[in-house]
């Protein structure tokens, strides 16, 4: 049975005023807007989750990534740090500011072609290897030029929202991130109260579409804070 308690899901790329979070172990979680699956969290363990400001990149803002604030510092203590600009050192794509990606340990500009649903196959920039993105590019185009130029469709694995087609965002889905639809008017959204507090969420919803914001549904004003239903509404 579908559960009517609509209270999980978060998204990394929330425009301001939608930063922050919610989500509790054992709460219902949803993968499709408005559709919930009870007890989704029973498959999750969080033994190694530390209650610090962030555990993963998607818990930070668009221009941030999650890491230990000190070099060689305690791996458990992680906070959201400002993204690295072009030509700065990096270890993964999320460390680089939007419009850039991590290649051979350096943030470089990502021209439109570089991203699609299965990003890493093209961007073979693993640091111990000599393959560069351009090598990957020349190899891939002959094999699958159609896929190379298309951005990720709904259900495709992604690293950030720019990997997804128009109308989709890149959001957490259990232990991966996939392209999901940006929310439409009337759809349930997640209003985050405090940045970096949604570590327990196993799904993320996208943000509300253009011209919409995530607000308490009018007839839910009387409800207790924890059960207030937020939906995407016109400004």
């Amino acid at each position: 049975t579908l559960n009517s308690v609509l209270n999980s899901n978060a998204i990394k790329n929330l425009p301001p005023p939608l930063g922050g979070a919610a989500g509790h172990p054992g709460s219902a979680v949803s993968a499709a807007p408005g559709i919930l699956y009870p007890g989704g969290n029973k498959y999750q363990t969080i033994d190694n989750y530390q209650p610090y400001p962030c555990a993963e990149d998607e818990e930070c803002g668009t221009d941030e990534y999650c890491a230990s604030p000190t070099r060689g510092g305690d791996a458990g203590v992680q906070i959201c740090l400002a993204c690295r600009k072009r030509r700065k050192r990096c270890m993964r794509h999320a460390m680089c500011c939007p419009g850039n990606y991590c290649k051979n340990g350096i943030c470089v500009s990502s021209d439109q072609n570089h991203f699609r649903g299965e990003i890493e196959e093209t961007i073979t920039e693993s640091f111990g290897n000599d393959h560069s993105t351009l090598d990957g590019y020349s190899r891939r185009t002959t094999l699958s030029s159609k896929m190379y130029h298309t951005k990720g469709q709904e259900g495709s694995v992604c690293l950030r929202s720019s990997d997804c087609a128009s109308g989709l965002c890149c959001a957490r889905h259990f232990w991966s991130k996939i392209c999901k639809p940006v929310l439409k008017e009337g759809q349930v959204c997640t209003k985050h109260r405090r940045k970096g507090s949604h570590g327990l969420e196993i799904f993320q919803r996208c943000y509300c579409g253009e011209g919409l914001s995530c607000r308490i549904q009018k007839d839910h004003h009387q409800a207790s804070n924890s059960s207030r239903l937020h939906t995407c509404q016109r400004h």
């Epitope: 993968a31 499709a32 559709i35 699956y37 989704g40 029973k42 498959y43 999750q44 363990t45 969080i46 033994d47 190694n48 989750y49 530390q50 555990a55 993963e56 990149d57 999650c66 270890m91 993964r92 794509h93 999320a94 991590c102 649903g117 299965e118 890493e120 196959e121 073979t124 920039e125 693993s126 640091f127 290897n129 393959h131 469709q153 709904e154 259900g155 495709s156 694995v157 690293l159 889905h173 259990f174 232990w175 991966s176 991130k177 996939i178 999901k180 570590g199 196993i202």
Partner: antibody, heavy 115, light 108 residues
Framework: QVQLVESGGGLVQPGGSLRLSCAAS????????MTWVRQAPGKGLEWVSG????????YYADSVKGRFTISRDNSKNTLYLQMNSLRAEDTAVYYC????????WGQGTLVTVSS | DIVLTQSPATLSLSPGERATLSCRAS???????LAWYQQKPGQAPRLLIY???NRATGVPARFSGSGSGTDFTLTISSLEPEDFAVYYC?????????FGQGTKVEIK
């Protein structure tokens, strides 16, 4: 190119333990969630466990919860599956695969639980 | 748990023929979070389709996926000798991730 190589399988007695490893190459390991799937001889595929890119989030099938532990060492580009209290029904080929729909798979490693 | 039922269990066809494999979910998936895999004896599975209809890298155009809700289809437009194998569908909407029991495509 993307490569996943499992190791650590073998024959073990019921109640015993085994640790499987999966060495990854050809992609930025910590960008991707990883998955373990198993296949009993002559049977279909069964999801076992998943872990997020940083290792902060782990998930298990009910059949292995409390007995198996998934982990990863991103500095070594390696995924692990620690299997304790093994049972005869855990006998299977264990595959590691990348992401939630498995776009790349290892060749598998056979785990046989028998007395 | 979402149960995926594949039909038929076995499909006997000749090279050049069209193969249509069905995967039915016990609950509406609402989103296209369904993948198809091909597995040959002694080998690991290989991803063919993800997101219900997106062909994975390097997969020939004769393979196509379609469907939504509870009914999904994998179509092989013209069977090649190397296509005779077992095919599995998998949903990744909710946990536990589940696979269909498989459809074996064999040479007639």
């Amino acid at each position: 190119q993307v490569q996943l190589v499992e190791s650590g399988g073998g024959l073990v007695q019921p109640g015993g333990s085994l640790r499987l490893s999966c060495a990854a190459s050809g992609f930025t390991f910590n960008n991707y969630g990883m998955t373990w799937v198993r296949q009993a001889p002559g049977k279909g595929l069964e999801w076992v466990s998943g872990i997020s890119g940083s290792g902060s989030y782990t998930y298990y099938a009910d059949s292995v919860k409390g007995r198996f532990t998934i982990s990863r060492d991103n500095s070594k580009n390696t995924l692990y599956l620690q299997m304790n209290s093994l049972r005869a029904e855990d006998t299977a080929v264990y595959y590691c695969a990348r992401t939630i729909y498995m776009d790349y798979w290892g060749q598998g490693t056979l785990v046989t639980v028998s007395s | 748990d979402i149960v995926l039922t594949q039909s038929p269990a076995t499909l006997s066809l000749s090279p050049g023929e069209r193969a249509t494999l069905s995967c039915r979910a016990s609950q509406n998936l609402f989103s296209p979070y369904l993948a198809w895999y091909q597995q040959k004896p002694g080998q690991a599975p290989r991803l063919l389709i993800y997101g219900a209809s997106n062909r994975a890298t390097g997969v020939p155009a004769r393979f196509s996926g379609s469907g939504s809700g509870t009914d999904f289809t994998l179509t092989i437009s013209s069977l090649e000798p190397e296509d005779f194998a077992v095919y599995y569908c998998q949903q990744y909407l909710t946990l536990p991730l589940t696979f269909g029991q498989g459809t074996k495509v064999e040479i007639k």
